[in-house]
Interface confidence: medium
């Protein structure tokens, strides 16, 4: 708490200016207006104050606002956003989505703070839904943000919505998040061509169930290896050497790489190894020939 | 990538002026602060002041006021240190930084030196 | 002036050692504490600022803590370029202040 006292004679603060940066702590608090402060917090920025002088102008702010800061005053915060406890945010309501870019703005390039994740779950809560435009500023900001969403939380994003990803917001998905995305970006890529929407849909396979991958297989779409690796190994157990082959197309000869790696290990221990010959790769570890493969799982089914 | 580029060596003569360049390259040189800190040889660092360069807005240690003023060129992406009534006390390496980023004394310029000498 | 001391001047290391370097500040500086790192002819370098924030880029075997008037910067894993003088620093309030440096050299 910074103790009360006078103002000085003639130091009452008329406008935020760079006068109030040689402004000792306790003349800050005794000199300066909050409601003065409210209305001018966007000079705050321009002016070189000290940390330990921005907590003088927060303290003014929190007994200005105690039930939280309007969205004038906080679209206009600056780097005193860095000051902000995730208990100040949760009194706030932040429904502008500029707003939200302003603040991003001030913790950009750092990762994401106590601070910066609880304002952007406070404005995904107010606007019921991640939309589009939400999404966009909050990938460009965090690559890495809607795998930081847990799959409950991804449920609520809109299909329109995944136009917004790029392939890189992706790379730390799990998936359990891609068996959630994927339905939606199928959805949302439904009325592309071929190419076009296996260029869309790659990212997502992750989350693909096998006859997709079956349907895939029959549309000439060169799947790289890389994408292969990261598909569910329940969904690539079931396809057959074939249904590969048209998968992967020339991509195919990079299965001898990763023969020791999953799925492609799994899957070759499901193949019958005449059939895994007929790759001309040297795959091994298949079914000889002559053994009877049960079905396990469709017996499990029907019992 | 965020570069301070200092201006080079300097031999003066007491009771004489001297001004240190610091240019900065690799972002919006205007949105965030630049320190001045200062370093005698065999001693520690001392933070002279900071200049917002946006504003022009500046800030001294008390120590070094009537001694350093601090300015800046928006249009060179430069910020200037000029030492006046120089003594021997003064000689030193004056380092110029960035708070970029609005992380404290984030990147440092290479140095200058400075040698007060009859 | 808030004065920062660093107690160790010298500290004797190994490859491969867990080393903490201490700064002790003469009143509370509400975690506003960074560290630098400075090897001989070079400028100094911000690893660590609000006491526990790593810089961009700066290897995760460094971390910073504490709170109130004492704070520690934290080599997880010696490395031989770790090898440098170290500074911690107060931001929180001018005239910023810096310790006078500990200096890490091999056993």
């Known amino acids: 708490e910074v103790e009360k006292t006078a103002c000085p004679s003639g130091k009452k603060a008329r406008e935020i200016d760079e006068s109030l940066i040689f402004y000792k702590k306790w003349e800050l608090e005794a000199c300066v207006d909050a409601a003065l402060l409210a209305t001018q917090m966007d000079r705050v920025n321009a002016i070189p104050f000290t940390y330990e002088q921005l907590d003088v102008l927060k303290h003014k702010l929190d007994e200005l606002y105690p039930q939280g800061y309007p969205e004038s005053v906080i679209q206009h915060l600056g780097y005193l956003f860095l000051k902000m406890s995730p208990e100040d945010i949760r009194k706030w309501n932040v429904t502008s989505l500029e707003t939200l870019k302003a603040l991003l703005e001030v913790n950009k390039g750092h990762e994401m703070s106590p601070q910066v994740a609880t304002l952007i779950d406070r404005f995904v809560k107010g606007r019921g839904q991640l939309d589009k435009d939400t999404l966009d500023t909050l990938t460009a900001f965090y690559p890495g943000y809607l795998c930081s969403l847990s799959p409950e939380e991804l449920s609520s994003v809109p299909p329109s919505s995944i136009w917004a990803v790029r392939p890189q917001d992706l790379d730390t998905c799990d998936p359990r998040q891609l068996d959630v995305l994927y339905p939606k970006a199928r959805l949302a890529f439904q009325n592309m061509n071929g190419s076009e929407y296996f260029v869309k849909i790659q990212s997502f396979l992750g989350g693909a169930p096998t006859e997709d991958l079956k349907a895939l297989s029959q549309q000439n779409v060169s799947m790289d290896l890389a994408t292969f690796m990261k598909l569910r190994t329940d969904a690539v157990l079931p396809l057959t050497v074939a249904e590969v082959q048209k998968l992967l197309g020339p991509h195919v000869e990079g299965l001898k790489a990763e023969e020791r790696h999953r799925p492609v290990r799994d899957w070759i221990l499901r193949q019958r190894q005449d059939d895994l010959d007929t790759l001309g790769l040297g795959l091994q570890g298949g079914i000889p020939n002559g053994y009877l493969v049960l079905d396990l799982s469709m017996q499990e089914a029907l019992s | 990538q965020v570069q301070l580029q200092q201006s080079g060596a300097e031999l003066v003569r007491p009771g004489t002026s001297v001004k240190v360049s610091c240019k900065a390259s690799?972002?919006?040189?205007?949105?965030?602060?630049i320190e001045w800190v200062k370093q005698r040889p065999g001693q520690g660092l001392e933070w002279i002041g900071v200049?917002?360069?946006?504003?022009?807005?500046?800030k001294y240690n008390e120590k070094f006021k009537g001694k350093a003023t601090l300015t800046a060129d928006k249009s060179s992406s430069t910020a200037y240190m000029q030492l006046s009534s120089l003594t021997s006390e003064d000689s030193a390496v004056y380092f110029c930084?960035?708070?970029?980023?609005?992380?404290?004394?984030?990147?440092w310029g290479q140095g200058t030196l400075v040698t007060v000498s009859a | 002036d808030i004065v920062m001391t660093q107690s160790h001047k010298f500290m004797s290391t190994s490859v491969g050692d867990r080393v903490s370097i201490t700064c002790k500040a003469s009143?509370?500086?509400?975690?506003?504490v960074a560290w630098y790192q400075r090897k001989p002819g070079q400028s100094p370098k911000l690893l660590i600022y609000w006491a526990s924030t790593r810089h961009t880029g700066v290897p995760d075997r460094f971390t910073g803590s504490g709170s109130g008037t004492d704070y520690t910067l934290t080599i997880s894993y010696m490395q031989a370029e770790d090898l440098a003088l170290y500074y911690c620093q107060q931001h929180y309030s001018t005239p910023y202040t810096f310790g006078g440096g500990t200096k890490l050299e091999i056993k």
């Open positions: 009143q509370d500086v509400s975690t506003a």
């Open positions: 930084a960035s708070d970029y980023d609005y992380d404290p004394f984030a990147y």
């Open positions: 690799g972002y919006a040189f205007t949105n965030y602060l």
């Open positions: 200049i917002n360069p946006g504003s022009g807005g500046t």
